[in-house]
């Protein structure tokens, strides 16, 4: 891999150390918080991201409507464990000792345990469905026309088969975006829909982990898109196993 | 059909400067990254910068940074090049090209360039 | 910026395939043919696998690593020009240009 070429850096990822120390002096880039090595040629895993985020210093609707089984990341950030791979580990614990299960997006998706707490596969998520709200616009945008810039920005920016990005619904000022990928329809090379979900969560946040041009340049026909509120909904390829204390 | 034409070439003076503007048409404009390259007689194509859609970025080769401004009129479909205090090294055939991913986080590339103008010729002399 | 590196020519007999490779960055490649000096250069790949409606389907483009390949399947005499590559992660590059010769 070469990062950018005037100045050894990775293109895809901010949170990185870059050096030329490759084979054959190539630039080569490493995880801050992990030092796992990374592709920046391509998104890297949320778990190796957010770990690194940890390590860093501190500073009769078109609309979906999430089934029960959906989840919202509540718990907020965490320092997690990632396999060789950089996907998460099926069990996360803290320095406490305790110990709770998460999808493959990095979500905890039973009540908290302790070191007892058995979790037996990395249960993926493989529907993901993103709840925008946009700023207020002239008129409402139009549909086909919101619905091509979302999909272009997805494959071009997160590098995201088509085939994946499902649905773009609207109904003014809400957008969904709804990602659909099962674990038989992700191909090797395929970007993660969890990892394009983060980094479009983090572009419309204003925290780009891209280097370069910076920050989304949303336009529908001219007109700027921007996002004033993202909420995201997680469901499992396994419905979650929470006790009914949590429910209720 | 994607068409580019630029124009403003000519007889340039050294220290003076030129505005090439390239017009669009057969496309949505207002859609993609626009770049201009350059060819000096007998050599290579050199990148020379590139902006936005929207016109809020621009980016510029080393050799024309601080003297050359890119800007675009989207309701007019053009792109202009303002180059000033030119040198002989200015001297070439000057291309508006289009560039095919505005989204993609190393959009300057010029790997991105799917369609080309005709060319306007440049000569920086005395 | 670091150079991109093509081989200053090849050559073929019609019908044979021709590879063009181009290294130095990790970017996306594209690939522009110019047939004569001053004339326009025409893209025949871009985005490494992309080709334009316009061109055949001899033309096709690939990417291993920091390496970008333009293959022509069945060669022409009408093929005959220089190949430029480009590419960059920060900014535009090209490279200096495969001269493309049909025996």
């Known amino acids: 891999h070469t990062a950018a070429q005037d100045n050894c850096t990775c293109p895809t990822n901010k949170m990185t150390v870059c050096s030329p120390d490759g084979p054959g002096g190539r630039c080569q880039c490493r995880a801050l918080g992990s030092g796992v090595a990374v592709d920046c040629s391509t998104l890297t895993s949320k778990c190796l991201l957010l770990k690194a985020r940890m390590s860093a210093p501190k500073n009769a609707r078109t609309l979906v409507r999430p089934n029960e089984h959906a989840l919202v990341d509540n718990d907020g950030l965490y320092d997690p464990d990632c396999d060789p791979e950089g996907r998460f580990k099926a069990r996360q614990c803290n320095q406490t000792s305790v110990c709770w299960c998460v999808n493959s997006v990095g979500v905890r998706r039973t009540d908290k345990g302790d070191l007892s707490l058995r979790c037996d596969e990395l249960v993926r998520t493989h529907h993901i469905l993103i709840d925008l709200r946009h700023r207020p616009t002239a008129g409402a945008f139009n549909h086909s026309d919101l619905d091509a810039e979302l999909r272009r920005l997805f494959r071009e920016r997160y590098r995201l088969h088509p085939k994946f990005v499902a649905a773009v619904h609207y109904e003014q000022p809400t957008i969904q975006i709804e990602l659909r990928q099962n674990t038989s329809q992700k191909a090797a090379g395929d970007v993660d829909i969890g990892d394009a979900a983060y980094y479009f969560e983090r572009d419309v946040k204003g925290e780009s982990l891209f280097q370069g041009r910076g920050g989304l340049d949303l336009r529908v026909r001219g007109e700027p898109l921007q996002v004033e509120r993202t909420l995201i909904y997680y469901l499992d390829e396994i419905p979650p196993k929470f006790s009914m204390k949590r429910l209720t | 059909a994607v068409t580019l034409d630029e124009s403003g070439g000519g007889l340039q003076t050294p220290g003076g400067a030129l505005s090439l503007v390239c017009k669009a048409s057969?496309?949505?404009?207002?859609?993609?990254?626009m770049f201009w390259v350059r060819q000096a007689p007998g050599k290579g194509l050199e990148w020379v910068g590139v902006i936005n859609r929207s016109g809020s970025y621009t980016n510029y080769a080393p050799a024309v940074k601080g003297r050359a401004t890119i800007s675009r009129d989207n309701g007019q479909s053009t792109m202009r090049l303002q180059l000033n205090n030119l040198r002989a090294e200015d001297t070439g055939t000057y291309y508006c090209?289009?560039?095919?991913?505005?989204?993609?986080?190393?959009?300057?590339?010029?790997?991105?360039?799917?369609?080309w103008g005709h060319g306007t010729e440049v000569i920086v002399s005395s | 910026a670091l150079a991109l590196t093509q081989p200053s020519s090849v050559s073929a007999n019609p019908g044979e395939t021709v590879k063009i490779t181009c290294s130095g960055s990790s970017g996306s490649y594209g690939w522009f043919q110019q047939k004569s000096p001053g004339s326009a250069p025409v893209t025949v790949i871009y985005w490494n696998d992309k080709r334009p409606s316009d061109i055949p389907s001899r033309f096709s483009g690939s990417t291993s690593g920091s390496t970008g390949t333009l293959t022509i399947t069945g060669v022409q005499a009408d093929d005959e020009a220089v190949y430029f590559c480009?590419?960059?992660?920060?900014?535009?590059?090209f490279g200096a240009g495969t001269t493309l010769t049909v025996l």
């Open positions: 090209a289009r560039g095919a991913c505005t989204h993609c986080w190393d959009a300057d590339s010029a790997g991105y360039i799917d369609a």
């Open positions: 480009g590419n960059a992660d920060s900014s535009g590059t």
């Open positions: 057969g496309f949505d404009f207002i859609d993609y990254d």
